[in-house]
């Protein structure tokens, strides 16, 4: 029977979401509770490490939300963004694989604001490379496991 | 060893983005630089040609942006849209497989505007069929390789 | 030859879209016309039933639209949302796998409003479990087959 293909579906660790409105790397993800799971990949310091060369489909879903009882939003015009980043350990370097998002005016007198971003793409990954997620305005992240997550699954070998 | 499955991840050719605000087919994509790659599929006149019958997962990520230093936006109410189109050569015809987008009012006095669209779906494709991308407001496209791209990978044979 | 892997791509049944602005489960989908198709899965009462244990990639694309000739929108601030729900029959329970959407102010005097949501993720599914789609404001759904759809394809076995 062929070796099981690598995959991961990682959900945000609600207890460790950074505050603030600047761009940050999200460094705490669940890998073994609820919908979160991982196989033949490694979660290390919030980065998803590739253990097996291959072509992978990568995806991320990031939800932002704000309720009027939380006070005003950080700025009039928000940039709600996600970046899926590949880091190479051997040659220390980071590059954006995918980005998505929207500018939003959440200064209106609505009780509740919400916005989700989804990105996905097919990438060649080498063992030792790591995938991480950067977001703007982390204090606005929706901490639910169905809201803020990212993942990968191997589709085929490189050669 | 089984034949490598077809795939493509194509990124926008920043040098060839059309101007204007009307719907256009994007006709220039990279296939061999940065994250762009192709195997057992063909890029022809900006269309992704299928060489092998199969069920494919298709996806597209399209980012639009505008900075105040670029002057005013084309219209007060923008329709920022993407259409993933299948063209059959044998019986000349085109059909939308997927669409996404949003109407936006970017006439406010914000320094910067941004919006991304992502679509994806699972489709039966036959050899000779072609996939292309149409967008509205091409002059607002973000030319970064992590922003504006589309792709496909074969998941399984038809029979 | 290995058994064909399960998949489905289901498009909204335009004739059966519920009215209203409250959250509803969409209960009528096409499985055999246009782009819609299904294999080794079952469509039952609007729910996609899993017949074969496995890890599946699930996705949904939901488009909302409004034209001024249809009168005013239900509320000043719309919550345009999608929820991808897993129901277990053996232990009757429902859980959200994925959600996405945005709050929108469609009260402006634009001729046309449009907004699309895309979500996707990798999940372990067991035979007998069912996937369904809930949306807010169903009366605003775009009934085109390229606009409002969901699907799944099996990526690998569980063991």
């Amino acid at each position: 029977k062929p070796e099981a293909q690598p995959f991961a579906h990682l959900t945000i660790n609600a207890a460790s979401i950074p505050s603030g409105s600047h761009k940050v790397t999200l460094s705490s993800w669940y890998h073994d509770r609820g919908w979160a799971k991982i196989s033949n990949m490694t979660l290390s310091n919030g980065k998803l490490r590739v253990n097996q060369d291959g072509f992978y489909y990568l995806y991320a879903n990031i939800c932002f939300r704000h309720h009027e009882t939380s006070g005003s939003v950080p700025t009039d015009y928000l940039q709600l963004m996600v970046y899926v980043v590949k880091t190479s350990i051997k040659i220390p370097s980071s590059h954006n694989l995918m980005k998505g998002g929207s500018t939003k005016n959440w200064s209106g007198n609505s009780e509740f604001h919400f916005y989700s971003i989804n990105v996905g793409g097919f990438f060649k990954l080498r063992a030792g490379e790591e995938i991480s997620i950067q977001v703007s305005n982390p204090s606005l992240l929706d901490p639910d496991q169905d809201a803020t997550y990212f993942g990968a699954f191997k589709v085929q070998d490189i050669d | 060893k089984p034949e490598a499955q077809p795939f493509a991840h194509l990124t926008i050719n920043a040098a060839s983005i059309p101007s204007g605000s009307h719907k256009v087919t994007l006709s220039s994509w990279y296939h061999d630089r940065g994250w762009a790659k192709i195997s057992n599929m063909t890029l022809s006149n900006g269309k992704l040609r299928v060489n092998q019958d199969g069920f494919y997962y298709l996806y597209a990520n399209i980012c639009f942006r505008h900075h105040e230093t670029s002057g005013s936006v084309p219209t007060d109410y923008l329709q920022l849209m993407v259409y993933v189109v299948k063209t059959s050569i044998k019986i000349p015809s085109s059909h939308n497989l997927m669409k996404g987008g949003s109407t936006k009012n970017w006439s406010g006095n914000s320094e910067f505007h941004f919006y991304s669209i992502n679509v994806g779906g699972f489709f039966k494709l036959r050899a000779g069929e072609e996939i292309s991308i149409q967008v509205s407001n091409p002059s607002l496209l973000d030319p970064d390789q992590d922003a504006t791209y589309f792709g496909a990978f074969k998941v399984q044979d038809i029979d | 030859k290995p058994e064909a892997q399960p998949f489905a791509h289901l498009t909204i049944n335009a004739a059966s879209i519920p009215s209203g602005s409250h959250k509803v489960t969409l209960s009528s989908w096409y499985h055999d016309r246009g782009w819609a198709k299904i294999s080794n899965m079952t469509l039952s009462n609007g729910k996609l039933r899993v017949n074969q244990d496995g890890f599946y990639y699930l996705y949904a694309n939901i488009c909302f639209r409004h034209h001024e000739t249809s009168g005013s929108v239900p509320t000043d601030y719309l919550q345009l949302m999608v929820y991808v729900v897993k129901t277990s029959i053996k232990i009757p329970s429902s859980h959200n796998l994925m959600k996405g959407g945005s709050t929108k102010n469609w009260s402006g005097n634009s001729e046309f409003h449009f907004y699309s949501i895309n979500v996707g993720g990798f999940f372990k599914l067991r035979a007998g479990e069912e996937i369904s789609i809930q949306v807010s404001n169903p009366s605003l759904l775009d009934p085109d087959q390229d606009a409002t759809y969901f699907g799944a394809f099996k990526v690998q076995d569980i063991d």
Epitope: - | H22, K23, Q79, S136 | R65, H67, F112
Partner: nanobody, 120 residues
Framework: EVQLVESGGKLVQAGGSLRLSCAVS????????MAWFRQGPGKGRESVGR????????YYADSVKGRFTISRDNATNTVYLQMNSLKPEDTAVYYC?????????????WGQGTQVTVSS
């Protein structure tokens, strides 16, 4: 195929009035609605208002509501834009446009435009 030709644009004093015409020819039966747009100097294109072929219902942008009126003459297949209480900020090239289907995101047919200049 539908052809649209605008006329009536000219220089006018602030507070004055002007009527623009859009002559519609060709397959007029295919039209769903007609709209007036304008593009001021250094600005993007702005919707002024629309008239629907089926019932002559009209819709207007906030900036012109109460001052501008769209109408049509079935006999001559002409669409009019009556502009009253003109302001300097109404200075623009005015275009008429036609659409064939309700849910089409773009207008299918456009005129060449007519210049309106409002002096203070």
């Amino acid at each position: 195929e539908v052809q649209l030709v605008e006329s009536g644009g000219k220089l006018v004093q602030a507070g004055g009035s002007l009527r623009l015409s859009c002559a519609v020819s060709g397959r007029t039966s295919s039209i769903y609605n007609m709209a007036w747009f304008r593009q001021g100097p250094g600005k993007g294109r702005e919707s002024v208002g629309r008239i629907y072929w089926s019932d002559d219902n009209t819709y207007y942008a906030d900036s012109v509501k109460g001052r501008f009126t769209i109408s049509r003459d079935n006999a001559t297949n002409t669409v009019y834009l009556q502009m009253n209480s003109l302001k300097p900020e109404d200075t623009a090239v005015y275009y008429c446009a036609g659409k064939t289907t309700k849910w089409s995101l773009e207008y299918d047919y456009w005129g060449q435009g007519t210049q309106v200049t409002v002096s203070s």
